[in-house]
């Protein structure tokens, strides 16, 4: 039940961070235009991945789509690259994790395969987390860069004088949404990762199996277990003559698929 | 250089209608209206991508005032509903080159007068 849970949450908080993923990389608030020296505007800027947009102080806002490829910095090409392998990463990973779900039936699939997607879906969405935060991240390094860089010019103009022209930009709500996304993803494979160990089949120890001769009290005991129990030196079957009594080892079981939780 | 010559501006009734034209000589990226009430600074009312035809209007004229436009005549219209005293203005005809943002504006009709009086 609480491997169940733990799966079930897990593949809810993904989904949650997988949707945020997307929804942070479709944003065009990723850096904003910084109002502290100036917050009465004419206009007000901010850019995203994808384009930048002008709000007029009417309300009026007009985007413009960053037609070059070449032409754009190195870095935005790896924030984007990152964001879209998080994103198709933690996409693969939901479907893989829907299949993985416990509480769903899909003809006789063994519990070891539904372990094992799980963990491959747990992994995808650790890989995508760390992706977006990554690509959030470096984002934000840019800008703290080109912030203080900016910061400096207006500062320090021709022969000391105050320029105030530059636009400085500062983070923007997308990156917040970017993080806390990222962050939901990571727990979440996480999680799923935990309910992996829950739902796979622990090493059963087959024990050895006792026949009774119908005349004599013969015990055949098959040594070949030896690597999976890590018992005696029992290499050849050897006739065990005990008169019939068994040891604990020894009592007859069959393994079931409720050995294991 | 692209002329506008706007028409339709008058007196009319609080509650009333009018339609504003706007006929540019040639094909531009965005045109747009903007209104002047007397002793105040330029407003920005309403405005059409003459490509793909979206369209923005003021929080103040919105389910009241549409903007329309006919490409094959490089024509652009306001028609006004519901006209409040708080409309009355000088409502000039602007189109951009490659923008729609009023720094970008690259040309500016001569203005028609609005007045909306009982």
């Known amino acids: 039940m609480a491997v169940t849970a733990c799966q079930g949450l897990g593949f809810v908080v993904s989904l949650i961070g997988i949707a945020g993923i997307i929804a942070a990389t479709c944003m065009d608030q990723w850096s904003t235009q910084d109002l502290y020296n100036n917050p009465v505007t004419a206009v007000f800027n901010y850019q995203g991945l994808w384009r930048s947009c002008v709000r007029e102080s009417s309300g009026f806002t007009e985007c413009r789509g960053y037609f070059t490829l070449l032409g754009l910095p190195a870095m935005l090409q790896a924030v984007r690259a990152l964001m879209i392998v998080g994103i198709v990463l933690g996409a693969i990973g939901l479907l893989v994790s829907i299949f993985a779900l416990k509480c769903i039936r899909i003809g006789s699939m063994e519990d070891s395969a539904k372990a094992n997607m799980t963990l491959t879906s747990g992994i995808m969405f650790i890989v995508s987390g760390l992706c977006a935060i990554a690509g959030v991240s470096v984002f934000a390094n840019m800008l703290v860069t080109n912030f203080w860089m900016s910061t400096a010019n207006m500062y320090t103009g021709m022969g000391g004088m105050v320029q105030t022209v530059q636009t400085r930009y500062t983070f923007g709500a997308a990156l917040f949404v970017g993080w806390v996304a990222g962050g939901l993803t990571l727990i979440g494979g996480v999680m799923m990762c935990i309910a992996c160990r829950g739902l796979a089949p622990e090493e059963t120890n087959y024990k050895a199996v006792s026949y009774h001769a119908s005349g004599h009290s013969v015990a055949y005991k098959p040594g070949g277990f030896k690597a999976s129990t890590g018992f005696g030196s029992n290499t050849k079957n050897k006739k065990i003559y005990d008169g019939g009594a068994r040891t604990e080892d020894e009592v007859q079981s069959y393994p079931s698929k409720h050995d294991y939780v | 250089q692209v002329q506008l010559d706007e028409s339709g501006g008058g007196l009319v009734q609080p509650g009333g209608s009018l339609r504003l034209s706007c006929a540019a000589s040639r094909s531009t990226y965005c045109m747009g209206w903007f209104r002047q009430a007397p002793g105040k600074g330029l407003e920005r009312v309403a405005n059409?991508?003459?490509?793909?035809?979206?369209?923005w209007l003021a929080d103040s004229v919105k389910g009241r005032f549409t903007i329309s436009r006919d490409n094959s005549k490089n024509t652009l219209y306001l028609q006004m509903t519901s006209l409040r005293a708080e409309d009355t203005a000088v409502y000039y005809c602007?189109?951009?080159?490659?923008?729609?943002?009023?720094?970008?504006?690259?040309?500016w009709g001569q203005g028609t007068l609005v007045t909306v009086s009982s």
């Open positions: 059409v991508y003459m490509r793909n035809g979206d369209t």
């Open positions: 602007a189109a951009g080159r490659s923008s729609c943002l009023e720094a970008s504006i690259s040309y």
